[in-house]
């Protein structure tokens, strides 16, 4: 929001770490869609859907010693956008990754503005602030040219290959390591 009255409230973007995806004990080369409701997180019956999940997160907005009278509810974008798109390669003992599809990230799509009233201690007058809250999420393309710091929170399954490196033919017999199997969805 481009609005002079808008203040970014400290701490509003500090989300709790979402739980790790549950392990998928894959015995067959099969990914089945169990049809869970679209925003119910971490359901092992359907980790294969494009599960860019909109998790509801309720918290109080704070600004210094002041705190919102009521908690605000917004969305946390969580989940993986489809199957792993990196393939392991093994040449001798060297293991590296190459892409077999574009990299997508579950990120905020639309925002909404909400005015909140902040109550302050010591009898100070309440403040009114407008905050920007996540309203929806989407699976957005991430290019290899994005700053690597944007990827710091993602593990090896989502690390991009070196810039400019051409995908090489995969070594015969190279198998996906367990990390990829667990995060393949």
């Amino acid at each position: 929001f481009k609005n002079d009255a808008t203040e970014i409230i400290p701490g509003l973007r500090e989300y709790p770490e979402p739980p790790q995806e549950l392990e998928n004990n894959q015995t067959m080369n099969r990914a089945e869609n169990g049809g869970r409701p679209p925003h119910h997180p971490y359901d092992t019956k359907d980790v294969s859907e494009y599960s860019c999940r909109e998790l509801h997160y309720t918290r109080f907005v704070t600004d210094g010693p002041c705190r919102s009278a009521k908690p605000v509810t917004e969305l946390v974008c969580s989940g993986q956008c489809g199957p792993a798109r990196l393939l392991p390669n093994a040449i001798g003992r060297v293991k590296w990754w190459r892409p077999n599809g574009p990299d997508f990230r579950c990120i905020p799509d639309r925002y909404r503005a909400q005015r909140v009233q902040l109550l302050c201690p010591g009898g100070a007058a309440p403040r009114s602030r407008k905050v920007r809250l996540v309203a929806s999420c989407k699976c957005k393309r991430l290019t290899r040219f994005h700053n690597q710091s944007e990827l710091k929170d993602f593990g090896p399954e989502t690390a991009r290959p070196q810039k400019g490196r051409k995908p090489r033919p995969r070594a015969r017999g190279a198998k996906a390591n367990q990390a990829e199997l667990e995060n393949a969805y």
């Epitope: 894959q26 067959m28 080369n29 099969r30 990914a31 869609n33 294969s48 494009y50 860019c52 956008c81 489809g82 199957p83 792993a84 798109r85 393939l87 392991p88 892409p99 077999n100 599809g101 574009p102 997508f104 989407k138 699976c139 957005k140 393309r141 290019t143 290899r144 040219f145 400019g164 490196r165 051409k166 995908p167 033919p169 995969r170 996906a176 990829e180 199997l181 393949a184 969805y185």
Partner: antibody, heavy 123, light 107 residues
């Protein structure tokens, strides 16, 4: 020559399931995710989802959630797409497609397509 | 989902004509826009990727341009084999989506 060859036409009743196959040749099957796209008669193209043959992991367009399953058999370099609880509006040509890559532009595109499998849903 | 709107939905042209097809995305898709050609009873064929990159083997009379939300496919001099339906496709946001198609017919 890189080729994707699909199974033959199917006629199904509403509520039934259909399983379409796509046999790949001319490239290393596990190096590319396989995508599925469908086209209803006289209509445009609709992307259904993809599968990673290397891990078996798949991702589907939410429109088909709960009804579609994509699988692969790496020993025969074949991808499968099963659609359940068929309705008349599932009548379409179903295509498998491979995603190609341009390293310079870091971009991807459907560079190889199967010939299509016609699925007719009628009572 | 990102909506891809093509215009016109159909057009009539003669051999040698210059033909322009437009594709508009409902939100910014950068340059992640591909064009496909489809003939009746056949699978689509890739013509152009990344907005303007011509696939190897595609005649140079085909060209693409645009960025963000507005894109154009141009055929500089229409040939008999170019009569077909053309689709745009965005690769920026899942699910991938296609335009409704533009049918190029013989006048």
């Amino acid at each position: 020559e890189v080729q994707l060859v699909q199974s033959g036409a199917e006629v199904k009743k509403p509520g039934a399931s259909v399983k379409v196959s796509c046999k790949a040749s001319g490239y290393t099957f596990t190096d590319y995710n396989m995508h599925w796209v469908r086209q209803a008669p006289g209509q445009g193209l609709e992307w259904m989802g993809e599968i990673n043959p290397n891990s078996g992991g798949a991702g589907y367009n939410q429109k088909f959630k709960g009804r579609v399953t994509m699988t692969t058999d790496t020993s025969t370099s074949t991808a499968y797409m099963e659609l359940r609880s068929l309705r008349s509006d599932d009548t379409a040509v179903y295509y498998c497609a491979r995603l190609g890559y341009d390293d310079i532009y870091d971009d991807w595109y459907f560079d190889v397509w199967g010939q299509g499998t016609t699925v007719t849903v009628s009572s | 989902d990102i909506q891809m709107t093509q215009s016109p939905s159909s057009l009539s042209a003669s051999v040698g004509d210059r033909v322009t097809i437009t594709c508009r995305a409902s939100q910014d898709i950068s340059n992640y826009l591909n064009w496909y050609q489809q003939k009746p009873g056949k699978a689509p064929k890739l013509l152009i990727y990344h907005t303007s990159r011509l696939l190897s083997g595609v005649p140079s009379r085909f060209s693409g341009s645009g960025s963000g939300t507005d894109f154009t496919l141009t055929i500089s001099s229409l040939q008999p084999e170019d009569f077909a339906t053309y689709y745009c496709q965005q690769g920026d946001t899942l699910p991938y989506t296609f335009g409704g198609g533009t049918k190029v017919e013989i006048k």
